[in-house]
């Protein structure tokens, strides 16, 4: 499979484990790969009793769930752990958990960077 | 296409060392974090070590800290993988595998080699 | 650490037969979750990342679905060239990966 049209080649970097899997903790991820192979960004995190827990997030590997995604929506309707991916730049900030079965959109908002 | 080749297993004392090489070559070596899964006869798959892509982060199993090193060399396209105070339960097939980007699959693996640890 | 189980650790099946094994972690892996298959004196082979994506060039009668912590590989109609041991993987908690017991496919 080809690059797709909006062809991904950063995505926003969030590790939580990051101490100990001695990572960054955040930032952006340059995705690098082969010409055959498309590549999405994802996000993962844990909605406990209505607090958002980030987990991950960083590129994804070629993968037809993320084709043409533009923006990264959760759909499984109540994982241990949530997980989206989409296509182009950056398109991993904001997530949004939209079960398939029907139910509220929510949308995650990333908090404002404070000023350096 | 995308080739991975071991070398420098062989039949070592306890107490031993030896130092297992993987030349990597059709794809960019410098791009990807790499890693070491061993096999021991008849038994399953156990992660080793694994170095990213820089060589800057280097991660060990409980099994080999503080006796195996993993280096690579992104001019020579080759990772190392230095085994010191080598124990008869180290005894195994070496595989070097390149990981990708996430969820970080072992997408191409060499065909490896053995290292027995007998006295 | 993360422990994966798979079962069956052995199964002997026929041609044309229909294959599942199944993995399970000891805590939500998300879809970081890999298959490979092995035969005798050979190194393994990627066949599905991330819980469910085909590997360039893997036959589309192996499938893997699940996430969290349960996941299957089926195999939809078994073949010669399949009987091997596969093993699945968490790559969650990187790189400190963990593999499965692996289960072997024999010819019944």
């Known amino acids: 499979s080809g690059r797709g049209e909006a062809e991904t080649r950063e995505c926003i970097y969030y590790n939580a484990n990051w101490e100990l899997e001695r990572t960054n903790q955040s930032g952006l991820e340059r995705c690098e790969g082969e010409q055959d192979k498309r590549l999405h960004c994802y996000a993962s995190w844990r909605n406990s009793s209505g607090t958002i827990e980030l987990v991950k997030k960083g590129c994804w590997l070629d993968d037809f769930n993320c084709y043409d995604r533009q923006e990264c929506v959760a759909t499984e309707e109540n994982p241990q752990v949530y997980f989206c991916c989409c296509e182009g730049n950056f398109c991993n900030e904001r997530f949004t958990h939209l079960p398939e079965a029907g139910g509220p959109e929510v949308t995650y908002e990333p908090p404002p960077t404070a000023p350096t | 296409e995308v080739q991975l080749l071991e070398s420098g297993g062989g039949l070592v004392q306890p107490g031993g060392s030896l130092r297992l090489s993987c030349a990597a070559s059709g794809f960019r070596f410098g791009n990807y974090a790499m890693t070491w899964v061993r096999q021991a006869p008849g038994k399953g798959l156990e992660w080793v070590s694994a170095i990213g892509a820089s060589g800057g982060s280097t991660y060990y199993a409980d099994s080999v800290k503080g006796r195996f090193t993993i280096s690579r060399d992104n001019s020579k396209n080759t990772l190392y993988l230095q085994m010191n105070s080598l124990r008869a339960e180290d005894t195994a097939v070496y595989y070097c595998a390149r990981e990708n980007v996430a969820p970080r699959p072992l997408d191409y693996w060499g065909q490896g080699t053995l290292v027995t640890v007998s006295s | 650490d993360i422990q994966m189980t798979q079962s069956p650790s052995s199964l002997s099946a026929s041609v044309g037969d229909r294959v599942t094994i199944t993995c399970r972690a000891s805590q939500s892996v998300s879809r970081f979750l890999n298959w490979y298959q092995q035969k005798p004196g050979k190194a393994p082979k990627l066949l599905i990342y991330?819980?469910?994506i085909l590997q360039t060039g893997v036959p589309s009668r192996f499938s893997g679905s699940g996430s969290g912590t349960d996941f299957t590989l089926t195999i939809s109609s078994l073949q010669p060239e399949d009987f091997a041991t596969y093993y699945c993987?968490?790559?969650?908690?990187?790189?400190?990966?963990?593999f499965g017991g692996g289960t072997k496919v024999e010819i019944k």
């Open positions: 993987q968490q790559s969650y908690t990187t790189p400190t990966w963990t």
């Open positions: 991330g819980a469910s």
